[in-house]
């Protein structure tokens, strides 16, 4: 079907304007014929017939509405993420991980410490199993809750004597100033203990152990 | 605009039936006026002329089809929070919080050591200042990584003298077995101290805090 | 001092903490509202095709039937 | 007085402040899906608007013209 | 040999694991609301277009042929 | 035994934590994201109807009059 | 009414082990920790250990530390203290008592009537 | 660690007040407890918290505490009175039980 169209005539007796014509179908013809449509430029009661192009410009509003709220709210959220304006406290809540299930989770790092003694090698690989690494100490100021911990406990750093080296499990080099190493007993691997301090203990002594994992 | 419907006639030579007539308009005028529309039943070359009614049948199979994929989209996001099956380790990996940005999450609580020492009225008003509390220690299973904090620190608890109990700032009376406590000096104020031990101290001595916070 | 020298302990968690149920960004009246919107606009749509939709019918069109190049039917 | 004088101590802890029962859930391949999904549903909704809206001339509709009652135009 | 021997240690920490920064918020009572309104809403779109789009067929409109100029019809 | 024992240290860190990296996964740059396709899409679907809509006026057709049976002016 | 009941002692080498016992009764025995205390012939009051009341903590003097263990088994209502590496200084009659306080660690409430320990060869 | 001192013995004529003292470091910030042995017997609480009293135990005995020096009062001393009285505090810090050296309260 198409629109019904001709071209103007000087002869008026030969054409009628449809002026007073009402094209249009029954009603619930039109309901369900013209949906979303945009009334052609006809001289037509558009408005009162429903017209498709009325009908089209409200679902354009109505999708422009829709348009305007989503992005109002969207923004209400990106805002919200921005400044959360909930909390008092600077920089907003926020969540911390992921962590394995109930590990400590601090400044995005997940820290678990595990009461059962074991050797250097079996902490490792308790900590592997579950996706983790012996504790890494990368920085004082990302790691302050480490000085409040109590006791010994392995961490992953190893003893290359090859050049005298400390060196964690990922390969890097110990930096300087960030633990103080004493010696407990001779040995290739450290103990972590409070305040960042580091104690040499041999690989096979059983002792509690600290998994670490990275999430930034 | 209208549809142009007349009724049918005997008389062959009054009337044409528009099998063979076109009455579309350009096509670009069709294609910008007569959007999501069904088409009427009449014979004509509905398919090839982009019906309305195809074309509005297009648009509810593709609406059906948004529907399907947001269903399946939104239940995939559901059922991942019911099990998420992504993560290797029992119960998968989860985040922990909401807490104050830098704060220490453990299993949904949020914690912070503060250096400087206050007495128990200022250290209280820090926490509260952070919407938070002094530490109120109420389960040993849910709270394990206190075991391992070294120092004494203030926590929410005050004894009753009237009836000689102690008390969390709530005002719950503290459940016997959870901490031991121990006077350090004559006081109505609690440190807590590693593996559940309270010391009493003078409220007004000046101590290192735990503030915290209970999500859950 | 002691702790009974202060009349009362200050009043304590005045809200919760951050409210956020479970979520800086995404609280739960934020997506409450997000839901109740998208809600909305989809009835705004709907809405208004039955609106539009509804039929007018002008005086003239009483059979729902077009006559052409009948001027004394206008 | 000490603190036992006080009747009560303040209202502590009145509500949650989250749960995060099953964080994680949204994870960046899940959002980047849904936001695919719902770009792709939405750019099919535009694209079946062009795509059935598109012209297809029939051979005998040269001009755009319809012309009534004229068999020889057939 | 100690760990010297070895060239290197295991790569470690290949790739982050999450940032988070606003989560949880969707708790499964919320993503099922959330999910259940989408349904809704879409179904009631997409049955609004097959309700509105039903044909009614007029008595008289046995053919679906159009005839013009048929006055005595009327 | 020192780790010097072992050949090598197990690989670790296979794959990172529990994948969904970057949760919270509504971070700011995901969520800007997001808001930018849902008004994209948003405006793709706006605009279209308005382009679709928009009336093309053919030279001839001055005063949005329609007339019939003039074959003269065909 | 509090009754706390001491057993277990006895005669024994410089080097063995003793095992003591207190059953308790009339109270909630799980709440309180325990102490035991020793006076040695002629001498004053001298407190050995104390185990709290869920048992997870435990205290010893300096002189005891490493040789003694306390314990307690709150389904019997009775605490113990193991003896090992026992020395002649060690001779004492042993009091177990139960601590005033329920949370706290403070004073001794409730004695028992002791049970004499004697290392000698 | 932490030292209690008491004097050895005190001596008192029946119906006056006896007073038996002991002696720390700052004992006023601690809390003091005071226990009676007679010859024979298992020690009893006596004053509990530097001066309250357990259910049972005479009004006669009474508590203070401050500076340098705690102090267990017994008025109108009795014969039966006659007993070994032992002071005992916490030390928080080194989480030890300390008791006097015991004091022989001798009624004349």
């Known amino acids: 079907m198409g629109w019904i169209r001709g071209r103007r005539s000087r002869h008026s007796w030969e054409m009628s304007e449809f002026h007073n014509y009402n094209l249009d179908l029954k009603k619930s013809d039109f309901s369900t014929r013209w949906q979303k449509q945009r009334c052609p430029v006809v001289k037509s009661k558009c408005r009162e017939n429903a017209s498709p192009f009325f009908f089209c410009c409200f679902i354009a509003v109505a999708m422009g509405i829709r348009f305007i709220i989503m992005v109002t709210i969207w923004s209400a959220v990106f805002l919200n993420s921005l400044f959360n304006q909930e909390v008092q406290i600077p920089l907003t809540e926020s969540y911390c991980g992921p962590c394995p299930k109930n590990w400590i989770c601090y400044k995005n790092n997940c820290y678990q410490f595990f009461d059962e003694s074991k050797n250097w090698y079996e902490s490792q690989a308790s900590c592997m199993s579950q996706n983790a690494s012996l504790l890494k100490v990368y920085s004082k100021e990302d790691q302050d809750l480490l000085k409040l911990v109590k006791s010994y406990h392995w961490m992953g750093l190893v003893h290359i004597p090859t050049n005298g080296s400390w060196q964690w499990e990922d390969g890097s080099i110990l930096s300087p100033n960030l633990l103080t190493i004493i010696e407990m007993q001779k040995g290739d691997c450290a103990l972590y203990a409070s305040s960042f301090k580091g104690y040499i203990e041999n690989c096979s002594t059983p002792n509690t152990y600290i998994c670490m994992q990275r999430t930034v | 605009m209208g549809w142009i419907r007349g009724r049918r006639s005997r008389h062959s030579w009054e009337m044409s039936e528009f099998h063979n007539y076109n009455l579309d308009l350009k096509k670009s005028d069709f294609s910008t006026r007569w959007q999501k529309q069904r088409c009427p039943v009449v014979k004509s070359k509905c398919r090839e002329n982009a019906s309305p009614f195809f074309f509005c049948c297009f648009i509810a199979v593709a609406m059906g089809i948004r529907f399907i994929i947001m269903v399946t989209i939104w239940s995939a996001v559901f059922l991942n929070s019911l099990f998420n099956q992504e993560v290797q380790i029992p119960l998968t990996e989860s985040y922990c919080g909401p807490c104050p940005k830098n704060w220490i999450c453990y299993k949904n609580n949020c914690y912070q050591f503060f250096d400087e020492s206050k007495n128990w009225y200022e250290s209280q008003a820090s926490c509260m200042s952070q919407n938070a509390s002094l530490l109120k220690v109420y389960s040993k299973e849910d709270q394990d990584l206190l075991k391992l904090v070294k120092s004494y620190h203030w926590m929410g608890l005050v004894h009753i003298p009237t009836n000689g109990s102690w008390q969390w700032e709530d005002g719950s009376i503290l459940s016997p077995n959870l901490l031991t406590i121990i006077e350090m000096q004559k006081g109505d104020c609690a440190l807590y101290a590693s593996s559940f031990k309270g010391y009493i101290e003078n409220c007004s001595t000046p101590n290192t805090y735990i503030c915290m916070q209970r999500t859950v | 001092t002691t702790p009974g020298e202060r009349s009362s302990l200050p009043a304590f968690y005045p809200g919760t903490s951050g409210s956020c149920s479970g979520c800086g960004s995404l609280s739960l009246p934020l997506l409450a509202g997000l839901v109740a919107a998208d809600a909305v606009a989809s009835l705004l749509i709907v809405g208004a095709v039955f609106l539009c939709a509804r039929p007018r019918r002008s005086p003239a069109q009483e059979d729902g039937k077009v006559y052409i190049n009948m001027p004394g039917r206008g | 007085t000490t603190p036992g004088e006080r009747s009560s101590l303040p209202a502590f802890y009145p509500g949650t402040s989250g749960s995060c029962s099953g964080c994680g859930s949204l994870s960046l391949p899940l959002l980047a899906g849904l936001v695919a999904a719902d770009a792709v549903a939405s750019l099919l909704i535009v694209g079946a608007v062009f795509l059935c809206a598109r012209p297809r001339r029939s051979p005998a509709q040269e001009d755009g013209k319809v012309y009534i009652n004229m068999p020889g135009r057939g | 040999t100690t760990p010297g021997e070895r060239s290197s240690l295991p790569a470690f920490y290949p790739g982050t694991s999450g940032s988070c920064s606003g989560c949880g918020s969707l708790s499964l009572p919320l993503l099922a609301g959330l999910v259940a309104a989408d349904a809704v809403a879409s179904l009631l779109i997409v049955g609004a277009v097959f309700l509105c789009a039903r044909p009614r067929r007029s008595p008289a409109q046995e053919d679906g042929k159009v005839y013009i100029n048929m006055p005595g019809r009327g | 035994t020192t780790p010097g024992e072992r050949s090598s240290l197990p690989a670790f860190y296979p794959g990172t934590s529990g994948s969904c990296s970057g949760c919270g996964s509504l971070s700011l740059p995901l969520l800007a994201g997001l808001v930018a396709a849902d008004a994209v899409a948003s405006l793709l679907i706006v605009g279209a109807v308005f382009l679709c809509a928009r009336p093309r006026r053919s030279p001839a057709q001055e005063d949005g009059k329609v007339y019939i049976n003039m074959p003269g002016r065909g | 009414e509090v009754q706390l009941l001491e057993s277990g002692g006895g005669l024994v080498q410089p080097g063995g082990s003793l095992r003591l016992s207190c059953a308790a009764s009339?109270?909630?025995?799980?709440?309180?920790?325990m102490t035991w205390v020793r006076q040695a012939p002629g001498k004053g009051l001298e407190w050995v250990s104390i185990?709290?009341?869920?048992?997870?903590?435990?205290f010893y003097a300096d002189s005891v530390k490493g040789r003694f263990t306390i314990s307690r088994d709150n389904s019997r209502n009775t605490l113990y203290l193991q003896m090992d590496s026992l020395r002649a200084e060690d001779t004492a009659v042993y009091y177990c008592?139960?601590?005033?306080?329920?949370?706290?660690?403070?004073?001794?409430?409730?004695w028992g009537q002791g049970t004499l320990v004697t290392v000698s060869s | 660690s932490y030292v209690l001192t008491q004097p050895p013995s005190v001596s008192v004529a029946p119906g006056q007040t006896a007073r038996i003292t002991c002696g720390g470091n700052?004992?006023?910030?601690?809390?003091v407890h005071w226990y009676q042995q007679k010859a024979g017997q298992a020690p009893v609480l006596v004053v509990y918290?530097?001066?309250d009293r357990p259910s049972g135990i005479p009004e006669r005995f009474s508590g203070s505490n401050s500076g340098n020096t705690a102090t267990l009062t017994i008025s109108r001393v009795e014969a039966g009175d006659e007993a070994d009285y032992y002071c005992?505090?916490?030390?928080?810090?080194?989480?030890?039980?300390?008791f006097g050296g015991g004091t022989k309260l001798t009624v004349l």
């Open positions: 918290d530097d001066s």
């Open positions: 008592a139960k601590e005033g306080k329920w949370v706290q660690l403070s004073h001794f409430a409730n």
């Open positions: 009339g109270f909630t025995f799980s709440i309180y920790a």
């Open positions: 185990i709290s009341g869920s048992g997870d903590h435990t």
């Open positions: 005992q505090v916490w030390d928080g810090r080194s989480d030890h039980v300390v």
């Open positions: 700052n004992i006023g910030s601690k809390s």
